[in-house]
């Protein structure tokens, strides 16, 4: 769950998630509403959708702990464990690399962004 995600994001981006991403914009961190503010925020919105999909399948997304390896800058999700664990790892891997791809457009002003300012249509999954 959340411990896996925090560790993976730190390994891939080099940033401490609790200081840089949770929360950020309108979708990074718990919950999410409105139009994403930038590419980094879109990463989190897509990740929310990934989790939502697993929840509809019956996965316990916050409880499941998965195994993975981080080597030479890449994440290798374990082929063992449950289907939910494998898919959860895939969701987290995707958001970690998405955040890394968009480090150059990271905006400090969106850190602790005031959620009531998150307006517009929330993108569908």
């Amino acid at each position: 769950g959340i411990l896996n995600l925090n560790k993976m994001v730190k390994q891939v981006t080099g940033k401490m998630p609790i200081l840089s991403y949770w929360p950020y914009g309108c979708h990074c961190g718990l919950g999410g509403r409105g139009q994403p503010k930038d590419a980094t925020d879109w990463c989190c919105q897509t990740h929310d959708c990934c989790y939502d999909h697993l929840k509809t399948q019956g996965c316990s997304i916050y409880k499941d702990y998965y195994r993975y390896n981080f080597s030479q800058g890449n994440i290798h999700c374990s082929d063992k464990g449950s289907w939910c664990e494998q898919q959860l790892c895939a969701c987290d891997k995707e958001v970690a690399f998405c955040l890394k791809r968009n480090l150059d457009t990271y905006q400090k002003r969106l850190r602790f962004y005031w959620r009531p300012h998150c307006r517009g249509q929330t993108p569908g999954c």
């Epitope: 019956g58 082929d79 063992k80 449950s82 289907w83 939910c84």
Partner: antibody
Framework: QVQLKESGPGLVQPSQTLSLTCTVS????????MHWVRQPPGEGLEWMGV???????HYNSTLKSRLSISRDTSKSQVFLEMNSLQTEDTAIYFC???????WGQGTLVTVSS | DIQMTQSPSSLPASLGDRVTITCRAS??????LRWFQQKPGKSPRLMIF???NLANGVPSRFSGSRSGSDYSLTINSLESEDLAIYYC?????????FGGGTKLELK
């Protein structure tokens, strides 16, 4: 080491209910998904359903209306129940631990009067 | 549902031949593909996992590859013990699907 073994009746009457048990050892059912797969004589493999490590179940849409999978984690057993059996349900029934690295030896079920 | 189209259904070959079996996925399954070998009266045996990784105890003459939505199992130099039926399996979705099988037999 990891072991899986299916057990149940070899012969079932048409329209009756099939009950199979998969007894496992070497691991805990609360940590792994368990699948049922069947194979009619001379044919290919057909996925039937799964009971996840968290207890949730999913079934093949073609069998959903008559299939039920459950488990007893304390006894390390997974159960398959399928009703309204017909001759085309004659097959070898396998249980397998996800991600399909371990399989039982299979049990032949013949549906005949 | 994701369909796995396996070909050929039958493959006559000679000992020492290099043989290739293919599965095509109807949707993106990434590397969530496994190959199994099954001999008469036996359970399926895992040969390849993650599309390209050799399972424990599998001879190095076996290999797996991927090109887009096409997945292949290759046996470099066929031996008599390799004669069997081979199945692919996708497990990207929670409801996995098998290919129809390929019967590898002597010419």
């Amino acid at each position: 080491q990891v072991q899986l073994k299916e057990s149940g009746p070899g012969l079932v009457q048409p329209s009756q209910t099939l009950s199979l048990t998969c007894t496992v050892s070497g691991f805990s059912l609360i940590s792994y998904d368990m699948h049922w797969v069947r194979q009619p004589p001379g044919e290919g493999l057909e996925w039937m359903g799964v009971i996840w490590s968290n207890g949730n179940t999913h079934y093949n849409s073609t069998l959903k209306s008559r299939l039920s999978i459950s488990r007893d984690t304390s006894k390390s057993q997974v159960f398959l129940e399928m009703n309204s059996l017909q001759t085309e349900d004659t097959a070898i029934y396998f249980c397998s631990r996800y991600p399909f690295a371990y399989w039982g030896q299979g049990t032949l079920v013949t549906v005949s009067s | 549902d994701i369909q796995m189209t396996q070909s050929p259904s039958s493959l006559p070959a000679s000992l020492g031949d290099r043989v290739t079996i293919t599965c095509r996925a109807s949707q993106d399954i990434g590397d969530y593909l496994r190959w199994f070998q099954q001999k008469p009266g036996k359970s399926p045996r895992l040969m390849i996992f993650g599309a390209t990784n050799l399972a424990n105890g599998v001879p190095s003459r076996f290999s797996g590859s991927r090109s887009g939505s096409d997945y292949s199992l290759t046996i470099n130099s066929l031996e008599s013990e390799d004669l069997a039926i081979y199945y692919c399996l996708q497990h990207k979705e929670y409801f996995p699907t098998f290919g129809g099988g390929t019967k590898l037999e002597l010419k």
